[in-house]
């Protein structure tokens, strides 16, 4: 969480982010909240990208004012214009890509003052993985995949059964490219696994960690995923 | 109202260097980029680069990569633009401009570069 | 680079008249998502700097006479005077703001006939 606060002029508001990461060809939304303004037309919201000319976005006069956007952003950006009133300046950024990553900046002006924080946005892939037994397999072996990742992960098994030990040398991990030739799907085979045991695929890089279990007994297979985005930290 | 006042005209020797300055007022400085655009005599507008102040981040006309220098203060509110290596075609009259659309205008500096 | 190609080079119109400027864009400078031009004019007086007359192709800046007029899209515009007073004397130039390098026409001297 960083809280900035506002500087010479007017009295200073203060203006909170998150730090946050975006999933590259998803939306991706930026975190900023300000004290609120009784007055939308006295609210301008501005976001500024370290590297970038032009703005980001700018809304002003309870409307978006697009004239000094830069060309990067140009049809990806919107910020709540319903919730704007109540002090959320919060950012949707369409279509994320990897050079969207970097430092922000929310900057706030009302009637009560300025305000500004800066916000760091991490892009990557990330996605859940699946893990199935691989009936095609001559002994009995689980196979972990997940979609798309990016950069390219850690890939760890684990065990009710044997915990802390390590499955390195009875798995097989493999990233293939994906067609767009910057996310990999991401293929981990364990071999010689036990019945009535509970295993988990663990999946993450700097951006995100994604764990996917399955138990196995002699009656039935349960399956559970989840995925985690890490340093989620406010400003 | 927002102001951008210029320093004052310059003569220099080829080869030497000039510092133009451009003083902003009256409004928020540091969000808006402030671009340099030059004039030569009875030429017309030449975007030569701009800075986003709260960043320092530059961005230069590819003709004139290498040779200007653009920075700015944000304490003072205040954006530089430095041209080395002048050459006598760098006579102009160079504005500063704040905004992608340039909605406000320095009065202009004019650059005299004659041995 | 956009290239931004302006016409006539020189006007002369009678006051009262209608004054027309061209201007030609190398690439459209319209982004369909919006259906906005990037596209502004501007008017510089002798010893002056340009003043903002016209953005998004025919928005008037604030202030601005509605004698002033823009229209066009893609890479056709055109910059109106419909009623040429005295005090338009000056030299008009169109910009793109749709990519950097942002661009400019080479200027439109109008003098009155």
């Known amino acids: 969480l960083i809280i900035g606060f506002g500087i010479s002029g007017r009295h200073s508001i203060t203006v909170t982010t998150v730090a946050s990461a975006g999933n590259i060809g998803e939306d991706g939304i930026l975190s900023c909240t300000f004290e609120p303004d009784i007055k939308l037309s006295d609210i301008v919201i501005q976001w500024l990208k370290e590297g970038v000319l032009g703005l980001v976005h700018e809304f002003k006069e309870g409307k978006d004012e697009l004239s000094e956007q830069d060309e990067m952003f140009r049809g990806r950006t919107a910020v709540f214009a319903d919730q704007v009133i109540v002090g959320n300046a919060s950012l949707r950024l369409k279509n994320v890509q990897l050079t969207d990553a970097g430092t922000y900046k929310c900057y706030i002006i009302t009637s009560k003052g300025k305000g500004n924080a800066n916000l760091e946005y991490k892009t990557g892939a990330f996605s859940m993985p699946e893990v199935n037994v691989d009936y095609n397999a001559s002994s009995e072996t689980l196979r972990c995949e997940a979609p798309r990742w990016f950069p390219q992960p850690t890939v760890v098994w684990a065990s009710q059964v044997d915990q802390g030990a390590n499955f390195s040398e009875v798995s097989n991990t493999s990233f293939e490219l994906n067609s767009e030739n910057v996310t990999m799907k991401v293929v981990s085979v364990l071999y010689n696994v036990t019945i009535n045991n509970t295993y988990s695929c663990m999946i993450e890089n700097d951006i995100a960690k994604a764990t996917g279990d399955i138990k196995v007994t002699e009656s039935e297979i349960k399956r559970r995923s989840h995925l985690q985005l890490l340093n989620s930290k406010a400003s | 109202q927002v102001q951008l006042v210029q320093s004052g005209a310059e003569v220099k020797k080829p080869g030497s260097s000039v510092k133009v300055s451009c003083k902003a007022s009256g409004g928020t400085f540091s969000t808006y980029a402030i671009n340099w655009v030059r004039q030569a005599p009875g030429q017309g507008l030449e975007w030569m680069g701009g800075?986003?102040?709260?960043?320092?981040?530059?961005r230069y006309a590819q003709k004139f990569q290498g040779r200007v220098t653009i920075t700015a203060d944000e304490s003072t509110s205040t954006a530089y633009m430095e041209l080395s290596s002048l050459r006598s075609e760098d006579t102009a009259v160079y504005y500063c401009?704040?905004?992608?659309?340039?909605?406000?205008w320095g009065q202009g500096t004019l650059v005299t570069v004659s041995s | 680079d956009i290239v931004m190609t302006q016409s006539p080079d020189s006007l002369a119109v009678s006051l009262g008249e209608r004054a027309t400027i061209n201007c030609k864009s190398s690439q459209s400078v319209l982004y369909s998502s919006n259906n906005k031009n990037y596209l502004a004019w501007y008017q510089q007086k002798p010893g002056q700097p340009p003043k903002l007359l016209i953005y998004?192709?025919?928005t008037r800046e604030s202030g601005v006479p509605d004698r002033f007029s823009g229209s066009g899209s893609g890479t056709d515009f055109t910059l109106t005077i419909s009623s040429l007073q005295a005090e338009d004397v000056a030299v008009y130039y169109c910009?793109?703001?749709?990519?950097?390098?942002?661009?400019f026409g080479q200027g439109t001297r109008l003098e009155i006939k």
């Open positions: 998004w192709a025919s």
């Open positions: 800075i986003n102040p709260m960043f320092g981040t530059a």
């Open positions: 910009q793109q703001y749709y990519t950097t390098p942002i661009t």
């Open positions: 401009a704040r905004g992608r659309l340039h909605r406000h």
